[in-house]
């Protein structure tokens, strides 16, 4: 399944938009307005949000008044009104999408699809890998955990390099690197499982270069609403690529009659995409640091930013909740196709697999569900939040909490249904995943509300790192480890292969419930933290001497 880089990184791109708007206002001498980054301040959004230069926040899930409850509404100054209404106010320009820039964004998005396709092809042929290398569940889980760990460690390094060196070259080299490693890994002999584990770690490094640098190029190719739209397309590649990974894995191994061929598809496409990036993606200039950002950065160190974020309870709790989502998606994405295959063995609708290709149908169906629920979840979450905002200002974290708790119920039901009905299990997976993915865009919005603009990039990076560290970096291995542990203490048999993995996966709904609790905790502090953030933003646009952070 997918990681949550999706929403949070789109948030990072949107941060620049707010800064752009702020810079323009400062040049025109606009005064700070009520409860916003400025009177006409636009809020960056994650997912598929739209940034408006109005005093409403235009997000994927609708528009929200900027003034938080509990804060007195400060009347707009005449200057602000003039800035908003007068001829000098920046008018939204029609999106003049150059063919070249559009092609570049499309290729970068295609590359992101391939990143996730490659990542989840392994999950699609997991049963075959276990059979070929003769490894238990913990060994299979290690493949994804090693990948995520190396990805997690490499991402900040590439972020640093991407700010200093030729991004296009780093990007292409990253794709060529992981393509070569994945292709080579399809020839590993069965006695060298450790080499496959190592190769997945190296692939994680290669893919980290892409995930960190590609969004920044899109950020520099486009501005305003077009940028948000392009980033949304880029991140919607995650559910699409993940689902296609399962589908590619299962269908290619069926067509070729050998699972090894599944690992040879994404490298070929990767090489082509890497070449297209070198040819078609323009060498863009990095966006200049805006005045507001410069003013703040002169007064705060990275350490101070980190301290402020750790003290921000809404941010901390929402980050922990995001980690819970990441834990569940990482574990379920890795193990559900295999679990459903084992369920069918027990139900006698499939045989225990001894010679590949194995469990192709389950990976295929699961892939299709993952693709669809990725989209449906974002739309559902956005719609629910829009509706709830009419009733409560704590809508964002509350919708996330309800989504998580609802998801936990359906994830639990997967294990009940799988004993008697595979179709029933798939229905539970569909609903559970949709509810789980419904908080993608909303989580990014929460971050935007409670973290000041000039701290958001750090906040996004830290949240992404935390969600991997506490989430999907360890969960696939942990589930495999628990499954093996249960089998050791009971017995090894077809029934216990199924039951032990099911019992191990039961950890996921508990973690999801914990995530729901964290979102409820976020709701408790959301309004006060939002008010604090808006107060700080108001102070930021005052003369430099009076800035306090």
């Amino acid at each position: 399944m997918m990681c949550l880089e999706c929403a949070s990184a789109a948030a990072g791109g949107a941060e620049e938009e707010e800064a752009d708007a702020e810079r323009r206002r400062r040049r025109r001498g606009a005064q700070p307005g009520a409860g916003g980054s400025a009177c006409c301040g636009a809020r960056g959004v994650g997912g598929a949000g739209v940034v408006s230069a109005d005093e409403e926040v235009q997000t994927l899930s609708g528009s929200v008044r900027r003034v938080p409850s509990g804060l007195p509404s400060i009347p707009s100054t005449p200057g602000c009104a003039a800035a908003a209404k007068g001829p000098s106010a920046p008018q939204p320009k029609p999106a003049s999408l150059g063919r070249g820039r559009g092609a570049a964004a499309a290729i970068l998005s295609l590359g992101n699809v391939l990143n996730y396709l490659d990542r989840y092809t392994v999950a699609g042929v997991l049963l075959d890998i276990q059979q070929h290398f003769g490894v238990k569940d913990r060994g299979a889980g290690l493949l994804q955990s090693v990948f995520i760990c190396s990805f997690m460690v490499a991402a900040p390094i590439f972020g640093y390099l991407g700010d200093r060196f030729n991004r296009k070259v780093i990007l292409s080299c990253g794709i060529f690197f992981w393509s070569a490693v994945t292709f080579s890994s399809s020839f590993i002999p069965q006695q060298y499982f450790w080499l496959l584990v190592l190769s997945r770690g190296l692939v994680g490094i290669g893919e980290a270069s892409y995930s960190t640098i590609a969004p920044t190029i899109i950020g520099d190719l486009f501005t305003k609403n077009t940028r948000t739209l392009m980033l949304s397309v880029f991140y919607f590649a995650i559910p699409l690529g993940s689902g296609l990974g399962y589908i590619t894995g299962s269908s290619v191994k069926q067509a070729a009659g050998d699972w090894h061929w599944a690992l040879r598809v994404s490298p070929v496409l990767g090489m082509i995409t890497g070449t297209l990036i070198l040819i078609l993606v323009p060498a863009t200039k990095r966006g200049h640091a805006d005045q507001l950002g410069g003013q703040l950065k002169a007064r705060t160190s990275w350490l101070r930013d980190m301290k402020a974020l750790i003290r921000n309870r809404s941010y901390v709790f929402s980050s922990l909740a995001t980690s819970a989502v990441s834990f569940a998606t990482g574990a379920l994405g890795m193990w559900i196709p295999l679990y459903l295959h084992r369920a069918q063995v027990v139900q006698k609708t499939a045989e225990t697999c001894n010679s590949p290709p194995c469990g192709a149908k389950d990976s295929l169906i699961f892939g299709a569900i993952t693709c669809f629920t990725g989209f449906l979840g974002v739309v559902t979450g956005a719609g629910a939040t829009r509706w709830c905002r009419l009733r409560t200002q704590r809508a964002d974290p509350l919708v996330c909490a309800v989504g998580m708790l609802g998801s936990a119920i359906f994830i639990c039901l997967i294990f009940v249904a799988a004993k008697t009905s595979i179709v029933g299990a798939y229905i539970c997976i569909f609903v559970g995943e949709t509810l789980l993915f419904s908080n993608w865009a909303i989580t990014a919005d929460i971050l935007m509300y409670v973290v000041i603009p000039t701290r958001r990039a750090t906040a996004v990076a830290l949240q992404s790192f935390t969600s991997h560290l506490l989430g999907d970096a360890g969960s696939p291995y942990l589930i495999g480890f628990i499954s093996d542990l249960i089998r050791q203490s009971t017995k090894d048999s077809p029934l216990w292969e199924f039951l032990s993995l099911g019992y191990a996966l039961m950890l996921c709904p508990f973690v999801v419930v914990l995530g729901g609790m964290f979102f409820l905790a976020t709701a408790l502090f959301f309004l006060s933290d939002r008010a604090k953030a808006e107060q700080q933003v108001n102070q930021l646009v005052m003369p430099p001497a009076s800035v306090k952070v």
Partner: antibody
Framework: QVQLQQSGVELAKPGSSVKISCKAS????????ITWIKQTPGQGLEYIGY????????YYNEKFKGKATLTADKSSSTAFMQLSSLTPDDSAVYFC???????????WGQGVMVTVSS | DDIVLTQSPALAPSLGQRATISCRAS??????????MHWYQQKPGQQPKLLIY???KLASGIPARFSGSGSGTDFTLTIDPVQSDDIATYYC?????????FGAGTKLELR
């Protein structure tokens, strides 16, 4: 369905060993678990143990530990059971069977008659 | 302790009648929603053949006149109506605990 083909009749002297085979064929989707069952007129059906042909892991009924040794050759899809230190009590029909589903014996070999006499 | 399965030793129904074979376990064989009791038929000189698994589910290729019922410790195999082809020994087997154990068998003979 998988077909399990067992080796022929075995005649052995007390104290010697015999190794009987069970070759799986037919459907490529075969059980990972090949089990062995002993049948005597007096004792009925007795479960000896299994070998997981995927992992090579074995399980033995306490009663048959030291008596039976289970092995498998993945390349030829064949499971083996060696019976050592034979006594007349070991005279029986030995079946191999695939363990599947909720741990039942789905497909059975035709059985091998082992006779131990001096 | 190993689970002991006790079967009635013999049964002699008339052709076309209903035959009921019982099997009692020394402890419950129910686990995780499954009744881990299975039934096999063995004709003279042949290998056993699976009839019923999970107490009540009919194995593939087995005629519908065979049915299984029961839960926990008491289980029944029913043949209705009995045909001449059904002359055999019927065994119950549990898979809840290692080692898996079989009943001593019930011999079905026609009256």
């Amino acid at each position: 369905q998988v077909q399990l083909q067992q080796s022929g009749v075995e005649l052995a002297k007390p104290g010697s060993s015999v190794k009987i085979s069970c070759k799986a064929s037919g459907n490529t989707f075969t059980s990972n678990y090949i089990t062995w069952i002993k049948q005597t007129p007096g004792q009925g059906l007795e479960y000896i143990g299994y070998i997981n042909t995927g992992s090579g892991k074995t399980y033995y009924n306490e009663k048959f530990k030291g008596k039976a040794t289970l092995t498998a050759d993945k390349s030829s899809s064949t499971a083996f059971m060696q019976l050592s230190s034979l006594t007349p009590d070991d005279s029986a029909v030995y079946f191999c069977a695939s363990l599947t589903g909720v741990d039942y014996f789905d497909d059975w070999g035709q059985g091998v008659m082992v006779t131990v006499s001096s | 302790d190993d689970i002991v399965l006790t079967q009635s030793p013999a049964l002699a129904p008339s052709l076309g009648q209903r035959a009921t074979i019982s099997c009692r376990a020394s402890q419950s064989v129910r686990m995780s929603g499954y009744n881990l009791m299975h039934w096999y038929q063995q004709k003279p000189g042949q290998q056993p053949k699976l009839l019923i698994y999970d107490a009540s589910k009919l194995a593939s290729g087995i005629p519908a006149r065979f049915s299984g019922s029961g839960s926990g410790t008491d289980f029944t195999l029913t043949i209705d109506p009995v045909q001449s082809d059904d002359i055999a020994t019927y065994y119950c087997q549990q898979s809840k605990d290692d080692p898996y154990t079989f009943g001593a068998g019930t011999k079905l003979e026609l009256r």
